[in-house]
């Protein structure tokens, strides 16, 4: 089932998803200049069955000057470096999240995606947040955010995560520095109310230990 | 109570755009996705698209992707959608709903009716 | 897209008789959502998720199902309950209904 609202603003913080529960969408995205091929898929789909999860469809972007000419491949060097994106040639999820039953890692790259990647989550993902460079987490309780149904309205959990002005960032989950590690899952909440952020955001994300910016929308 | 008014019925020709809107009350505007969906005579329903009304962002049923647009004014708690390069087969009753999960409240309806 | 199968499209019943409408999935589906609807009105949530009631509804309304075979089922029909019942998922975009099943005097 898909979450109708975003996860919370936390001020100076960001947030990642470290694995995509089966059922999340990714839009297929270009980048300027370029399109959707006419028969394209719109969205690629995290699917599975028991034992694996990958995502199905492939997004195509074409020149949108030039009718036949179609690339999905993974960019060229020279060409990641025109994009934000960098970090998503590899993997960035530890293994134990990566491997997650159920759930899929970040999709790789496909050639001229736009720099920004929509996703809509599904009931039972859970983002892990960080504060922004520059701030220090402290923590009243888990950094980290679960949409959950109740009443048939879906909503997130509020993350126990505060961001003050000092010189030092917190950690995603499996980075080197445990610091901002999460401890444990939000307890379960049964209120009908829903409270949502909608918002834009910068996520940072680690590709094989460095930490490079892109921007993601989440849905 | 939550409510969501929309404008009334219009009649419009061919060719034309119509702008309806669906004004939110009860609420924060802003914690729900406003969905928007149609309604032909005699038929079933469609769901258009949604907007976010904070930060504006859109999602499309793609068979109306070149034919609605929704915005929302945050000021004024409403959203809205225009419907552009009208024909006859847009007659309908289009409808606003909250959106956070299932559709609990909708807005009353708005019949348009496009005949030359 | 996810297409919705709603069986019968219409259906002729009485005051007090069994009434059972069926919605099939083109794919596998987290939940089914049922709304409700009189002419001239906006739709009215009925069931969420499946099988739980909306705010208001009378017991007599029930449904069930998973995967891609859903159920709505008024155990003893009243003559409130003559309207059209669409089913719902919002399990992937775009969001679709059941094409109605208009539920009438017999």
């Known amino acids: 089932e898909l979450c109708d609202d975003d996860p919370p603003e936390i001020p100076h913080a960001t947030f990642k998803a470290m694995a995509y529960k089966e059922g999340t969408m990714l839009n297929c995205e270009c980048k300027r200049g370029f399109r959707r091929i006419k028969s394209g898929s719109l969205y690629m789909l995290c699917t599975g069955n028991s034992s694996h999860s990958s995502w199905d469809n492939q997004c195509q972007c074409t020149s949108s000057a030039t009718r036949n000419t179609t690339k999905q491949v993974t960019p060229q060097p020279e060409e990641q470096k025109e994009r934000k994106t960098t970090e998503m040639q590899s993997p960035m999820q530890p293994v134990d999240q990566a491997s997650l039953p159920g759930h899929c890692r970040e999709p790789p790259p496909w050639e001229n995606e736009a720099t920004e990647r929509i996703y809509h989550f599904v009931v039972g993902q859970m983002v892990y947040y960080q504060c922004v460079q520059g701030y220090r987490a402290l923590h009243r309780g888990p950094a980290e955010s679960v949409c959950k149904m109740t009443h048939g309205k879906t909503r997130w959990t509020q993350p126990q995560l505060i961001c003050t002005g000092e010189m030092e960032t917190s950690q995603f989950p499996g980075e080197e520095k445990p610091q901002a590690s999460p401890e444990g899952r939000p307890e379960s909440e049964t209120s009908c109310l829903v409270t949502t952020t909608d918002f834009q955001i910068q996520t940072e994300m680690a590709a094989t230990m460095e930490t490079s910016i892109f921007t993601t929308e989440y849905q | 109570q939550v409510q969501l008014v929309q404008s009334g019925a219009e009649v419009k020709k061919p060719g034309s755009s119509v702008k309806v809107s669906c004004k939110a009350s009860g609420y924060t505007f802003t914690s729900y996705r406003m969905h928007w969906v149609r309604q032909a005579p005699g038929q079933g329903l469609e769901w258009i698209g949604y907007?976010?009304?904070?930060?504006?962002?859109?999602e499309y049923n793609q068979k109306f992707k070149d034919k609605a647009t929704i915005t929302a004014d945050e000021s004024t708690n409403t959203a809205y959608m225009e419907l552009s390069s009208l024909r006859s087969e847009d007659t309908a009753v289009y409808y606003c709903?909250?959106?956070?999960?299932?559709?609990?409240?909708w807005g009353q309806g708005t019949l348009v009716t496009v005949s030359s | 897209d996810i297409q919705m199968t709603q069986s019968p499209s219409t259906l002729s019943a009485s005051v007090g008789d069994r009434v059972t409408i069926t919605c099939s999935a083109s794919?596998?589906?987290?939940?089914m959502h049922w709304y409700q609807q009189k002419p001239g009105k906006a739709p009215k949530l009925l069931i969420y998720?499946?099988?739980n009631l909306a705010s208001g509804v009378p017991a007599r309304f029930s449904g069930s199902g998973s995967g891609t075979e859903f159920t709505l089922t008024i155990s003893s029909l009243q003559p409130d309950d003559f309207a059209t019942y669409y089913c719902h998922q919002r399990s992937t975009y775009p969001l679709t209904f059941g094409q109605g099943t208009k539920v009438e005097v017999k």
């Open positions: 907007i976010r009304p904070r930060g504006g962002y859109t």
């Open positions: 709903a909250r959106g956070g999960g299932v559709f609990d409240y």
């Open positions: 998720t499946t099988s």
């Open positions: 794919s596998s589906i987290s939940y």
